[in-house]
């Protein structure tokens, strides 16, 4: 496993395809992350609560997520070695208010032939 | 005047500075729009109503602004011509409900020397 | 501006069946929880049951739970409460209403349903 | 199901009054560092209006002379300086679980 910081982790490396982790307050209970490549949405999560607190979590593009109480990673399996790509986290909180969106951490990953490396560059 | 983009006329350029416009609906009453460059806030301006319907404007970076009903508009003297770095709005939805915060238009800016040139890339 | 209006209100016979809908307009509903909640005649609130944003999840009070069933149409935007088996207890002024995160923030005017043969 | 009480019943008040209203839960209603506690008004022939939730935050657009306080089960709906349009009926509510319930209710008349 490579990561791209040993600070944030937000880039990690397993079996050609890459996992990148969106942290959240702790303190927030119902929100929507999205990740961005560029300006293309990739993966989109949105968790909210009803009045009697059960708990809906919507995955609309139906990526590979692992949701905790303080991230939400997204697992891509083809990240695109075009080219160096930038990524970053969309953060939208709904809960606790007031309502507020924050640019999460981004980064550039840049891909080399089979060899995922990444170079990264945390920015929010 | 040289601009970015002729569609979107997000940067443009006068004696040596440039005019960032952050465009929103006209719809929008109350709002805090952010200009960023990279991870920090450069400009902030906020517009609020009371109930009395009295206008408030906000603007503790002091950044020298022109605010119209679709769009703030912030002048910067001495962008940073280090390198090409990436300028973005946030928009803060007060009123109308519901709350939100959107991602506009972003682009990257580089400056060679003392000429004032821009690449855009539109990504919200 | 935030619009809630409910309909299909009315007179209904024990153990029969009404289906109450819900406009709403001025917001995206397909990002929102809503909610049923009625009042009997000069009492208070009590809380009907919800449904999530896209339908699959509900929830029903106690006292109406296999009777009732909500559902929506986020193409059309409306909500619904479908209402079988009613007794005469489910007389009541049924609102409409919308869960904005933390807290019912919209409702509609109610549409009343008298139980009664 | 969580029990919510309300006192008093009714209350016979006068414009520039100071009013309490009263509610308490049968269990606590903290979730992490929120009380899950919503109080609402409503005016005779009409919906209820949203005032305070998490106990303490007013909704947009409410006067600032309602005021919400309390925690864990006991919590209290403060009208600073009374005025007609105040008049009616006032519920606390809770959304801590399933069924989320709400009070009997305080009516406000005019004395």
């Known amino acids: 496993e490579i990561n791209g910081s040993a600070d944030h982790r937000m880039f990690s490396f397993h079996n050609g395809g890459v996992q990148i982790s969106c942290k959240y307050p702790e303190t927030v209970q119902q929100l929507k992350m999205r990740l961005f490549r560029e300006r293309e949405v990739l993966c989109e999560l949105t968790k909210t609560k009803g009045s009697g607190n059960a708990v809906s979590i919507k995955n609309p593009m139906l990526c590979l997520y692992h949701l905790s109480n303080n991230s939400v990673s997204f697992f891509l399996n083809n990240p695109d070695s075009s080219q160096g790509s930038y990524y970053f986290c969309s953060l939208s909180i709904f809960d606790p208010p007031p309502f507020q969106e924050r640019n999460l951490s981004g980064g550039y990953l840049h891909i080399y032939e089979s060899q995922l490396c990444c170079q990264l560059k945390l920015w929010l | 005047e040289i601009n970015g983009s002729a569609d979107h006329r997000m940067f443009s350029f006068h004696n040596g500075g440039v005019q960032i416009s952050c465009k929103y609906p006209e719809t929008v009453q109350q709002l805090k729009m952010r200009l960023f460059r990279e991870r920090e806030v450069l400009c902030e301006l906020t517009k609020t109503k009371g109930s009395g319907n009295a206008v408030s404007i906000k603007n503790p970076m002091l950044c020298l602004y022109h605010l119209s009903n679709n769009s703030v508009s912030f002048f910067l003297n001495n962008p940073d011509s280090s390198q090409g770095s990436y300028y973005f709005c946030s928009l803060s939805i007060f009123d109308p409900p519901p709350f939100q915060e959107r991602n506009l238009s972003g682009g990257y800016l580089h400056i060679y020397e003392s000429q004032l040139c821009c690449q855009l890339k539109l990504w919200l | 501006e935030v619009q809630l209006v409910e309909s299909g209100g009315g007179l209904v016979k024990p153990g029969g069946s009404l289906k109450l809908s819900c406009a709403a307009s001025?917001?995206?509903?397909?990002?929102?929880?809503m909610d049923w909640v009625r009042q009997a005649p000069g009492k208070g609130l009590e809380w009907v049951g919800n449904?999530?944003?896209?339908?699959?999840?509900?929830e029903y009070s106690p006292f109406v739970k296999g009777r009732f069933t909500i559902s929506r149409d986020n193409v059309k935007n409306i909500l619904y409460l479908q209402m079988n088996s009613v007794k005469s207890e489910d007389t009541a002024t049924y609102y409409c209403?919308?869960?904005?995160?933390?807290?019912?923030?919209?409702w509609g005017q109610g549409t009343l349903v008298t139980v009664s043969s | 199901d969580i029990v919510m009480t309300q006192s008093p019943s009714s209350l016979a008040v006068s414009p520039g009054d100071r009013v309490t209203i009263n509610c308490k839960s049968s269990q606590s209603l903290l979730s992490g560092s929120f009380h899950y506690l919503t109080w609402y008004q409503q005016k005779t022939g009409q919906a209820p209006k949203l005032l305070i939730f998490?106990?303490?935050t007013r909704h947009t657009g409410v006067p600032d002379r309602f005021m919400g306080s309390g925690s864990g089960t006991d919590f209290t709906l403060t009208i600073n300086s009374f005025q007609t349009e105040d008049l009616g009926d006032y519920y606390c509510?809770?959304?801590?679980?399933?069924?989320?319930?709400f009070g009997p209710g305080t009516k406000l008349e005019l004395r």
């Open positions: 449904i999530d944003e896209d339908g699959s999840i509900t």
């Open positions: 209403t919308r869960w904005g995160r933390f807290a019912f923030d919209s």
């Open positions: 001025g917001f995206t509903f397909s990002d929102y929880w």
């Open positions: 998490y106990a303490s």
């Open positions: 509510h809770h959304h801590y679980n399933a069924p989320p319930t």
